[in-house]
């Protein structure tokens, strides 16, 4: 009896795992084996597919074959007993195009009101994603084990922290990877559950802010209790995308280790130009808080967003304010090549009633003033970037007297 060729061959590629599945064409024939050949683009000869020779089942794995994942290949299969069937050719395919992203590995760390999620690709040093490893983004679904109400979080990186959770509560989540550059969405990880801890008697520090004084950064935060010590750590922000990088490590700011005040001062040269994350932890000697929420710290914006310098031209019923670049020490103007908004506050010298103007322009008119009256003006700059929402401190107040009447022209 002639053997029929196997049919309906499916190629499943997940990360670096290449799996073939097919249907027997004749279930009644026993002791049949199956073998595959493959052919690369531009080749005439067929080569035996290692791992897929004389297979008794209807599934085989050819992951050991070192293929160029961007190169098209063709497969063929036949059945074998005493004789062989004709070859059945599978449509040619490019492994990279066909590949799915496998489930990522997930490690969870519990706090009382937060969970830290560490995500890494499921296949370490994957050949399939070798050129795209740093382009992975992840999305997750999280739910309270007791309620099952799901919340989705999109576009996160290899380390993500979810805040505002309840203590002593079990949360479950699953994560999948995506390669947006290739329009690929991966397979969900298994569900991971973790219980948040009992509430920490010491809350994490809050409202962390960085400002500049002279050649130093001043880092300030709020804390509920007195007689505490604090430590501050920093991390290059870009490393959040790549914890596999050996540089991924939170490091101490030496001048902010075991400080007993809710601020610390350290030289600007501690940080080179760049974007950093900062976090603070409190301790009372026996117990330690969890880490604070991380703040983003851009040396360009946060350090050098100095208060604006301005000149006032006084008229009888208005001021014309001309805003210039702030001066560094040495009287050189600071080049600020990101868009700013200016907040101008003015008041009558004899009154506490302040009025405010917000302007993008660097020449601003303050209208509706009374003649021969002393008004004071102060100004500050804000970045227009929502992600790096930063404000300078206010400039020193400058007070000027308006001119007598009829000088408004």
């Amino acid at each position: 009896k002639n053997l029929k060729s196997p049919q309906k061959v499916e190629v499943d590629i997940i990360d670096d795992n290449f799996i073939l599945r097919w249907n027997r064409s004749d279930e009644s024939v026993g002791n049949v084996t199956f073998s595959f050949d493959y052919q690369k683009t531009g080749m005439d000869n067929w080569i035996k597919l290692s791992g897929c020779q004389n297979i008794t089942s209807t599934k085989c794995n050819f992951s050991s074959l070192k293929l160029n994942v961007y190169e098209e290949i063709k497969l063929r299969i036949r059945a074998e007993k005493e004789n062989t069937s004709s070859w059945y050719e599978v449509d040619s395919f490019t492994p990279f195009r066909k590949a799915q992203i496998g489930p990522p590995e997930v490690h969870l760390e519990a706090e009382d009101k937060a969970i830290v999620i560490h995500i890494s690709p499921g296949t370490k040093d994957s050949v399939m994603w070798a050129l795209d490893g740093l382009s992975f983004t992840y999305s997750l679904v999280i739910w309270k084990n007791s309620s099952g109400v799901e919340e989705r979080i999109e576009n996160i990186y290899s380390r993500h922290k979810i805040y505002k959770l309840s203590p002593e509560t079990t949360y479950c989540l699953k994560v999948k990877a995506a390669l947006l550059t290739s329009w690929k969405i991966g397979v969900y990880s298994p569900v991971h559950c973790i219980k948040t801890t009992v509430e920490n008697e010491l809350p994490p520090p809050e409202n962390i802010e960085v400002s500049v004084q002279n050649q130093n950064y001043v880092l300030k935060w709020d804390y509920t209790y007195a007689n505490m010590t604090f430590q501050v750590q920093w991390l290059h922000a870009f490393l959040k995308r790549n914890p596999g990088n050996h540089l991924y490590k939170w490091k101490q700011i030496p001048d902010c280790e075991n400080v007993k005040t809710t601020q610390c001062v350290f030289p600007q040269n501690v940080f080179q130009k760049g974007i950093y994350l900062l976090r603070v932890q409190a301790s009372d000697g026996n117990n330690t808080s969890f880490w604070s929420e991380e703040i983003k710290f851009d040396t360009e914006i946060q350090a050098f967003l100095l208060p604006p310098v301005f000149n006032i031209r006084s008229l009888s019923d208005s001021f014309h304010i001309y805003i210039g670049a702030p001066k560094q020490s040495g009287n050189t103007p600071v080049i600020q090549d990101y868009p700013l908004i200016y907040e101008i506050i003015f008041w009558e010298n004899t009154s506490n009633a302040e009025r405010k103007i917000i302007e993008k322009k660097t020449d601003v008119t303050v209208p509706n003033l009374k003649p021969l009256t002393v008004y004071c003006v102060k100004a500050r700059a804000h970045t227009m970037d929502e992600k790096l929402n930063k404000s300078s401190v206010f400039s020193d107040a400058v007070c000027e007297k308006t001119k007598p009447g009829n000088t408004s022209k």
């Epitope: 519990a110 830290v116 973790i194 219980k195 009992v198 490590k249 939170w250 117990n287 330690t288 969890f290």
Partner: antibody, heavy 123, light 107 residues
């Protein structure tokens, strides 16, 4: 598979120093803390300190701070623990043990252990 | 330093028994607790981390529970190979500290 292989047993005189090695394989050496734990005969376990193999940052149990030195040789994925000014009560089995990932926010458990090195201090 | 107190310090049981060992910390350790098994002349072996998570390859008869300052290791049905000494360890604050151990013997 992850393996931590320690150097052989040592006999030392009081006042001397001992240096125990721990060679790691089967994982990315610079991604995990390496800890040292000792166990005196018939006694419990005592944590001595840990080192980050990527940059040699160390943390010590205050009890050993003045006498213990932890070092790394990245080229051979080996960590060393040197204990100085030995006394008879330092007779113990010394273990290296892999700790949590350095990139994690908090410390982790000790998931892989070396086979132990017996250090005997006797005059 | 955080003190870890294990109880009992020794325990006799038979194959098939359900066994519970407890560990109390002097401060809250926020589930940063591990359980280890040690057999004579061997290195300790990690069983449980994070108070409740079973280490890969460890039989499911071992389980961990607890929170705050009070933690428990349970062996649901003792097997002959389970007779050993068990240690708890906190890794919340440095120095990391261990309990004094619980020796589990055959009755």
């Amino acid at each position: 598979q992850v393996q931590l292989v320690q150097s052989g047993a040592e006999v030392k005189k009081p006042g001397a120093s001992v240096k125990v090695s721990c060679k790691a394989s089967g994982y990315t050496f610079t991604s995990y803390w390496m800890n040292w734990v000792r166990q005196a005969p018939g006694q419990g376990l005592e944590w001595m300190g840990k080192i980050d193999p990527s940059d040699s940052e160390t943390h010590f149990n205050q009890k050993f701070r003045d006498r213990v030195t932890l070092t790394v040789d990245k080229s051979t994925s080996t960590v060393y623990m040197e204990l100085s000014s030995l006394r008879s009560e330092d007779t113990a089995v010394y273990y290296c043990a892999r700790g949590g990932r350095i990139s994690f926010d908090y410390d982790g458990a000790l998931d892989y252990w070396g086979q132990g090195t017996l250090v005997t201090v006797s005059s | 330093d955080i003190q870890m107190t294990q109880s009992p310090s020794s325990l006799s049981a038979s194959v098939g028994d359900r066994v519970t060992i407890t560990c109390k910390s002097s401060e809250v350790i926020y589930n940063r607790l591990a359980w280890y098994q040690q057999k004579p002349g061997k290195a300790p072996k990690l069983l449980i981390y994070g108070a409740t998570s079973l280490e890969t390859g460890v039989p499911s008869r071992f389980s961990g529970s607890g929170s705050g300052k009070d933690y428990t290791l349970t062996i649901s049905s003792l097997q002959p190979e389970d007779f050993a000494t068990y240690y708890c360890q906190q890794y919340w604050n440095k120095p990391f500290t261990f309990g004094q151990g619980t020796k589990l013997e055959i009755k």
